[in-house]
């Protein structure tokens, strides 16, 4: 049952004389393994013998006999699925039909394969895409229906006979479906490749030429243009004429329209290959090109830069930057449309020419207030001198200048006066908006830049003001030179250094801390009695009567200041002692008599001693001597002595008379 045999292989294989052929082949004999295989060349079935006749190229039998041809022809298959064959070398007369006679135990089959062997290597075939456009990548394919393991080949690409530098990818196929060698080349054709010959060359392993295929490239592209201008440098003066010509060097397909563009914008009613510009003006300066279109798209020529030369136009000045801060740098730029560019500039400041300034830019490294004003310039080129434009204003800003603090009061200023000061300045830009004063005080500012100090203090020494715009400028401090009465007047004892004893020499000093003006007068007073007009008050020999409250008063032309009362204390021994008797110096016996030792002393008497008429001291030491009851024998003269830290004093004698009571007289 023939349907049981299934074969797969290429229908026809191609080769050339001396090459080889490799025949990929698979089969399936379903009833068992292959027992016999014969490869026929052009087999024919003999009905008489019921066998195939023809040249046997290969035979595999059970007895193992193989014809000599078998070295050239090899069966590379097996007994159940592979039927691959190789013929090496292959000859021209191998062309025709190859017959594979297969026999298994019960079945037979003849499978036919066509072999086409040419005398010389046949050419490969170049395949191109249906349309090629410039700059669009395409793949060129070179296909050869040949591949054999025993005969290596290579495919090379050439453009106009020169190997192409793009890398090609070569692939081979030796399968039951197809046998081929293919080379693919990725390529971005330019318009200049149009009409060029591309060759795919077949070479052997040594690079020897075997065959080739050629094609002519048809590269679709936009028109390629050349622009020509008269005059050739495209530099003209106003009023001259200019001619531009557009030439098409290549177009595929043919061009359809022509137009001209200036600075990218289409010029109306200019649809020929020649553009005539008569009596040009400076406005016609610019970049010109022609544009020609075909079905692919528009093509543009290179741009021609038409320069219409003219004398400088009225100039303008640009300032970097205004307003400028004093001390900063400023740059002035003279801007004037001109062609060719100006070669010389003249600069003006407030209408007066600035000497030595001939450049487009003027740089002032350190701006000063006098640099302010209007700056203008004039530009000059080979065609003439431009006009001076309106100019630009430079505003120079600076802190207030020459700031002074001015005292408005008549001099001198006295403590307690109301002082008015003004803050003056010479110039300022921008205007002064506020003022500051040092030191700070709870002072009035009745108007801008005026300070009023009510009841000025003696210690208000200096005042400074600042005038402020964006910056503050301080004036030198001004001395108020406030005049005031003597201050901190006090009495100071300068001698003796210790406590004052009666009879001492005493000096009191009138001190004060400060006075302005310095010339002063002194007054010494004790309880409203004037004592002297010197800075010192002197006592040659102080007496207790000099004790009391002393003050000194110091005055200058501004005022007068008194000291606190200073108490002068004089220490002296007890004096003016006397014995007083109570109830009197005559007392009746039996009554009470009190003797008191009266004295004047500083410090007070600390110790008393009593004496009788015999100068005998009595055992009593207090100020009072109390006799109770008093006896007639107590009659006599008594005296006392007082003692303090300074010394002793004694009283004169005082006589006490004690008389008998009526009772005593009665008894006698």
């Amino acid at each position: 049952d023939s349907s049981k045999w299934v074969f797969e292989h290429p229908e026809t294989l191609y080769a050339w004389e001396g090459a080889c052929v490799w025949i990929p082949c698979t089969y399936r004999a379903l009833d068992g393994d292959l027992e016999s295989f014969i490869l026929f060349h052009n087999p024919e079935y003999n009905k008489n013998t019921s066998k195939f006749d023809g040249t046997r190229l290969y035979e595999s039998t059970k007895d193992g006999k193989v014809p000599s041809e078998q070295k050239r022809v090899q069966f590379l298959g097996d007994k159940n699925k592979n039927c691959t064959l190789s013929i090496h070398p292959v000859h021209l007369n191998d062309s025709g039909q190859l017959g594979l006679r297969m026999e298994s135990k019960t079945e037979k089959w003849m499978e036919r394969i066509h072999l086409n062997v040419s005398e010389r290597p046949f050419p490969p075939h170049i395949q191109l895409p249906p349309e090629i456009q410039e700059s669009q990548e395409v793949t060129l394919t070179c296909l050869l229906n040949f591949s054999c393991y025993g005969y290596p080949i290579q495919l090379q690409w050439l453009l106009e006979g020169v190997p192409m530098r793009q890398a090609a990818v070569t692939s081979t196929s030796l399968t039951i479906k197809s046998v081929f060698t293919r080379s693919e080349l990725k390529f971005s054709p330019q318009w200049s490749h149009h009409g060029k010959i591309v060759t795919c060359q077949l070479q052997d392993a040594d690079g020897k030429f075997l065959s080739n295929d050629t094609v002519q490239l048809n590269v679709k592209h936009t028109p390629k243009l050349e622009i020509k201008v008269t005059p050739s440098d495209a530099i003209v003066r106003e009023g001259d004429s200019v001619t531009m010509t557009c030439e098409v060097s290549s177009s595929n397909p043919e061009y359809t329209t022509v137009s001209w563009l200036k600075d990218g914008t289409s010029l109306k009613k200019q649809n020929t290959f020649t553009l005539n510009l008569r009596e040009v003006t400076k406005d016609q300066s610019g970049k010109y090109c022609c544009q020609v279109s075909n079905d692919v798209g528009p093509g543009r020529s290179e741009e021609v830069f038409l320069q219409v030369q003219y004398a400088p136009e009225p100039s303008t000045v640009q300032i970097l930057h205004s307003p400028a801060v004093e001390g900063s740098q400023v740059e002035f730029l003279c801007m004037s449309l001109a062609n060719p560019l100006p070669t010389n500039y003249t600069w003006y400041h407030n209408g007066k020419e600035m000497q030595g300034r001939t450049e487009e830019k003027v740089h002032i490294p350190k701006i000063l207030p006098w640099h302010a004003g209007t700056y203008s310039c004039v530009a000059e080129n080979i065609l003439g001198t431009g006009q001076r434009g309106p100019g630009a204003e430079l505003d120079v800003q600076y802190p207030p200048k020459k700031v002074t603090t001015v005292i408005q009061n008549p001099m001198p200023i006295r403590e307690g006066d109301t002082v008015t000061l003004s803050c003056n300045y010479n110039s300022s830009n921008p205007s002064v908006t506020r003022y500051e004063w040092k030191p700070h005080g709870a002072w009035e500012e009745p108007s801008l830049g005026v300070l009023k100090i009510q009841n000025v203090g003696w210690d208000n020494t200096t005042i400074a003001c600042a005038a402020c715009n964006s910056w503050c400028s301080w004036a030198s401090p001004v001395a108020l030179n406030v005049q005031y009465a003597p201050r901190d007047v006090r009495v100071r004892k300068i001698k003796p250094l210790s406590e004052i004893h009666s009879g001492n020499s005493v000096s009191l000093q009138c001190d004060f801390s400060s006075s302005h003006p310095k010339e002063v007068q002194f007054f010494w007073e004790k309880n409203g009695r004037l004592l002297g007009k010197e800075s010192q008050l002197n006592f040659d020999s102080i007496s207790p009567e000099d004790a009391g409250s002393y003050s000194c008063w110091v005055n200058n032309s501004i005022g007068q200041t008194a000291s606190k009362a200073w108490t002068l204390e004089v220490l002296y021994a007890p004096r003016r002692l006397r014995v007083s008797m109570s109830p009197g110096d005559q007392v009746m016996e039996g009554k009470s008599a009190t003797l008191t030792c009266e004295s004047d002393a500083n410090p007070p008497v600390s110790h008393y001693t009593w004496f009788d008429w015999n100068n005998q001291s009595l055992p009593y030491h207090s100020q009072k001597l109390r006799l109770e009851p008093v006896k007639v024998q107590h009659s006599g003269a008594y005296w006392c002595q007082g003692t303090n830290s300074v010394g002793k004093g004694r009283s004169p004698l005082s006589t006490l008379t004690v008389y008998y009571s009526p009772e005593t007289i009665g008894r006698r």
Epitope: E415, G416, W458, Y484, A485, F523, E525, G528, L530, W553, N555, S557, I558, G559, Q560, T561, A562
Partner: nanobody, 114 residues
Framework: EVQLVDSGGGLVQAGGSLRVSCEAS????????MGWYRQRPGKERERVAV???????IYADSVKGRFTISRDNAKNTVYLQMNSLEPEDTAVYYC????????WGQGTQVTVSS
């Protein structure tokens, strides 16, 4: 002509208040320090308070916190405001300044009854 005119004295109960005044002429008043003095019965004259030309003040310890001395330069007048008066404050009160030399005003009697 140098002149001092004292006024405002009177009789007041203990704890009461009184203000005495002294108008001065014949000196530059605003530049003079002025003092109030008093003479108590049987006692030496004593200084009670002083107002300096800059209006700073000085008080005797015995009157501190009770008496206030002040001046009005526009009126050439010095004042003594006496509060919390005590019988010991009974005296003739005078105003004076060294600029007046030995000249004293007539004084003004202040009597504090208990």
């Amino acid at each position: 002509e140098v002149q001092l005119v004292d006024s405002g004295g009177g009789l007041v109960q203990a704890g009461g208040s009184l203000r005495v005044s002294c108008e001065a002429s014949g000196i530059t008043f605003s530049r003079a320090a002025m003092g109030w003095y008093r003479q108590r019965p049987g006692k030496e004259r004593e200084r009670v308070a002083v107002v300096n030309s800059d209006s700073s003040t000085i008080y005797a310890d015995s009157v501190k916190g009770r008496f206030t001395i002040s001046r009005d330069n526009a009126k050439n007048t010095v004042y003594l405001q006496m509060n919390s008066l005590e019988p010991e404050d009974t005296a003739v009160y005078y105003c004076w300044s060294p600029g007046f030399g030995s000249y004293w005003g007539q004084g003004t009697q202040v009597t504090v009854s208990s």
